[in-house]
């Protein structure tokens, strides 16, 4: 026997190292994506590594810098926008975040023809939103909750609205609840295709109750932040939609678009606006009880200078088993005849599919079908419809891009992405140029993400835009965990799960188990995507098994699973996590004395309820920024799934589903409760009430607050948070530090 010094064993395993928490917190293994900023059928802009704005022409293969990094730096610009006539660029600086999507900024207009900034009639600051018209170089912007229009960047502004008032009237931008729960944008104004008209929403928050919380800052006295925020059952914003002719804005001024009578008869929401042509617009409305949606197509009446929305152009979408739509009601994609459209909604079997609506919803032609779901319609051209779905190989957590030929009969379907890089890429999105002449595919995993450019006619790959080579090289000596996506069949319910296993996983050994849960309605956690994150580290370095489970209420597997939680939040989501844990124990490699659960936001709610389920399954758990009672959360979101907290509606389940009601059950678990004090979304109130209930029940628990931090717990708080949670879990699992 020859004994060799270990250094001679220069095998792969010896040179490879586990992930560290530092790797995660430093973002060492983050990836890049490439989304072209399309400006025509064959041209796009991209900000180079050295911050020049470069225009690429796919057909000539040429590229040139349209804006130098020197110009960008002169105003500290962090973003830009080219006018469609290519004469001007707006430069955005002094970015100041407000809520999830909204921010204010300072804007400078740069004239490309003379290489100078536009002087005279400069824009005020800070601006809440600014955008170019789709043609030419008109500007619309929102300043102090009012909308302004400029025919040219150097012109004096035309003030469109005058009633804007902080926290009271919002013009062209959403209030808090519309931004977060309905529009998912920072803007609420929409140019018509050729810039003739500008549509905008006005939100009146005068009667909405206000959430107030302290912002401690550095001053002697804390500031109070006040946000009109309708909680479940409270008074909601009143919305009105107006359209103004931007060629002659003072001619008749803003004209209000009528609300369909069946919607206006009680509380309602505006959900989206889609321009069809310059003189046809489509509005979507939703009853406050969110199971009825109306799509209304309106036409400009030149003779009356008004917008007419005939009843014959109203299309009703109703759900009898849950709420309308998925997370949001889907938006229409109009075809070239400017009246018929494609839209995703539930078919008779309860799966979300693409339908073609020509006259009435009842006569809709189903375009896709099967026990899977169409997820997004990217583009409709005269001969093709591009969409994404999770059809391929029956994995709900995948996304592939398909093309349906609508120019021929019968229409033929082709999967564009299914076999491109099959092992590496199973989760795609796409970005199309004008007329879908070209498109970019962005693959998010399960392998290292890659972005590619393709010919819109042949689907041929033209070039790789970003392949994350540096990341690939950096990961070569890292012991990454193994990941598997599988399913459990329990009582006619399919529970898909993702398991993240330590690099040297051995089925004959026992491992601590951490469940990571979100579980909110219409969410999906089990996805075939690449990630090197905190749970990757826990598996790689700390030897934990981590599992994510999509239970009832989650998306893209049909209405039966999705709507199972309707009016009963906090029941089945928790049951299904528990069921999955029991199945994992049966697999034989889980140490049943070391099982934990953690989640953030809705996941914090589910993890709290799971810990307090009285099953004895969980040793410990963490809730970050949890909802604790649905009476504390936003009306638009909560009522969609729970109805109203009134005696004649669903008050009983609102009361039964609180974390506080289960305070006694936390006695036999280790609970770590975490929340930011400046959380505008899930208010600190939620955790304050949990803590109060636990104290009143004389139950011991651990807690951490993050002063002046919002729902995201960003910056240095992130490092502190993950370090703190790591210590907690290692202590819980008796792992040495």
């Amino acid at each position: 026997i020859v004994l060799r010094p270990s250094r001679v064993h220069n095998s792969e395993e010896n040179t490879m190292r586990a992930l560290t928490l530092k790797d995660i917190l430093n973002g060492t293994f983050s990836y890049k994506t490439f989304f072209p900023n399309w400006i025509s059928g064959q041209e796009y802009l991209h900000q180079s590594a050295d911050n020049n704005i470069v225009l690429y022409n796919i057909e000539t293969g040429q590229s040139y810098t349209i804006l130098s990094n020197r110009t960008m730096k002169s105003v500290n610009a962090s973003n830009y926008g080219l006018s469609p006539d290519r004469q001007f660029v707006y430069l955005e600086s002094d970015y100041s975040k407000l809520w999830r999507y909204s921010y204010t900024a300072t804007y400078y207009i740069y004239d490309l023809s003379n290489g100078e900034f536009v002087r005279g009639n400069e824009l005020p600051r800070p601006i809440q939103y600014l955008c170019w018209s789709p043609v030419g170089s008109k500007l619309a912007y929102v300043y102090q909750n009012n909308i302004y229009l400029k025919q040219r960047p150097g012109d004096p502004p035309f003030q469109i609205t005058f009633n804007g008032r902080e926290n009271k009237i919002f013009n062209g931008i959403p209030d808090w609840v519309y931004e977060e729960e309905m529009l998912a944008t920072k803007y609420a104004l929409w140019w018509s295709p050729n810039g003739k008209f500008l549509a905008y929403a006005e939100f009146n928050d005068t009667d909405i109750p206000v959430i107030a919380y302290s912002y401690y800052g550095d001053e002697q006295y804390p500031r109070t932040i006040n946000i009109p925020y309708p909680k479940a059952g409270a008074k909601n914003p009143v919305v009105r939609i107006f359209i103004i002719d931007t060629t002659y804005p003072a001619y008749v001024g803003p004209q209000e678009v009528p609300v369909p009578a069946m919607i206006a008869s009680s509380d309602y929401y505006f959900s989206w606006l889609t321009w069809v042509t310059d003189e046809r617009v489509c509005l979507q409305w939703l009853k406050r009880v969110q199971n009825v949606s109306v799509l209304s197509i309106c036409d400009f009446r030149e003779d009356w200078q008004t917008w007419d929305c005939p009843k014959t152009q109203e299309h009703i979408e109703e759900s009898r088993t849950g709420w309308a739509g998925g997370f949001f009601v889907s938006t229409p994609v109009f075809s070239y005849d400017a009246i018929s459209y494609y839209k995703i909604f539930s078919d008779k079997d309860g799966y979300k599919h693409i339908h073609y609506i020509k006259d009435t919803v009842e006569n809709a032609i189903q375009i896709t079908s099967g026990k899977w779901e169409a997820i997004n319609i990217f583009r409709v051209t005269q001969d093709s419809l591009f969409y994404s779905s999770n059809e391929f190989e029956e994995y709900p957590g995948r996304r592939n891009i398909y093309r349906i030929s609508i120019g021929s009969y019968p229409p033929s379907k082709k999967c564009v992405t299914c076999h491109l890089r099959k092992e590496r890429c199973q989760y795609y999105t796409a970005s199309f140029s004008d007329y879908a002449k070209y498109y970019a595919l962005v693959c998010y995993g399960p392998g290292i993400p890659i972005s590619t450019l393709h010919d819109g006619r042949t689907d041929q790959e033209i070039k790789i835009l970003e392949e994350n080579k540096e990341l690939e090289n950096a990961l070569k000596n890292i012991q990454l965990p193994k990941e598997e996506i599988k399913k459990l069949e329990v009582d006619e319910i399919t529970l898909w799960y993702k398991m993240i296993l330590p690099p040297q996983f051995d089925r004959s050994k026992k491992y601590p188990l951490l469940i990571q849960v979100y579980g909110g309605p219409c969410s999906q956690s089990v996805r075939s995507v690449f990630a090197v994150n905190w749970i990757s580290y826990l598996a790689s370095k700390e030897g934990m098994v981590i599992a994510l489970v999509d239970g009832r209420g989650t998306a893209f597997q049909g209405d039966k699973l999705l709507y199972a939680v309707y009016r009963k939040l906090g029941v089945y989501e928790v049951e299904d996590q528990i069921t999955a844990v029991r199945k994992f124990i049966e697999m034989g490699f889980i140490d049943e004395k070391r099982i934990a659960i953690w989640g953030w936001s809705y996941g914090g709610y589910v993890s709290s309820l799971a810990l307090a389920s009285g099953t004895g399954l969980f040793k410990c758990g963490i809730a970050v920024a949890p909802v604790s009672s649905w009476e504390y959360y936003a009306s638009v979101y909560t009522e969609r799934f729970m109805g109203l907290p009134t005696k004649d509606d669903n008050l009983e389940h609102y009361k039964n589903s609180t974390v506080m009601a289960r305070a006694e059950y936390f006695r036999n678990v280790d609970y770590l409760l975490i929340h930011g004090t400046a959380d505008d979304n899930v208010h600190f109130q939620n955790s304050a009430q949990i803590a109060k209930a636990l104290v009143n029940a004389q139950v011991d628990f651990q807690a951490m607050w993050y002063s002046d931090q919002n729902h995201g717990l960003s910056g240095l708080s992130t490092n502190h948070l993950y370090t703190h949670m790591t210590h907690f879990l290692k202590q819980c699992f008796s792992l040495s530090d």
Epitope: R240, P249, A250, G253, V257, P258, D303, W304, Q305, T306
Partner: nanobody, 125 residues
Framework: EVQLVESGGGLVQPGGSLRLSCAAS????????MYWVRQAPGKGLEWVSA???????EYPDSVKGRFTISRDNAKNTLYLQMNSLRPEDTAVYYC???????????????????WGQGTLVTVSS
């Protein structure tokens, strides 16, 4: 009762000027959109100028730079100053008003809510 009474029309030579007035009564003048609209012999209606409640003005290309609309809110009067008149400006000129709708009152039967009787402007040598 809403009343709009135009005056100031007449015969004028090409290149000449005229000033039309419109006295309004029976409604709150300030928050309205006011117009001068004309109808040439055998032709349809054509708007020639507009002024909004904030005093901002609009003109079609055919009269831009020659006509000026203004309002005197204290006197409830609308004016149209017409310079460099041309034979094709010959028409009956009407003063019209459009009242901003209240909440949920979007429906109309025409672009203007009230009209005057009109005043004739003839441009001829």
């Amino acid at each position: 009762e809403v009343q709009l009474v135009e005056s100031g029309g007449g015969l004028v030579q090409p290149g000449g000027s005229l000033r039309l007035s419109c006295a309004a009564s029976g409604f709150t003048f300030t928050p309205t959109y006011m117009y001068w609209v004309r109808q040439a012999p055998g032709k349809g209606l054509e708007w020639v100028s507009a002024i909004d409640p904030y005093g901002r003005t609009e003109y079609p290309d055919s009269v831009k730079g020659r006509f000026t609309i203004s309002r005197d809110n204290a006197k409830n009067t609308l004016y149209l100053q017409m310079n460099s008149l041309r034979p094709e400006d010959t028409a009956v000129y009407y003063c019209a008003v459009r009242v901003p709708p209240g909440v949920y009152t979007y429906y109309r039967t025409g672009p203007y809510d009230y009209w005057g009787q009109g005043t004739l402007v003839t441009v001829s040598s």
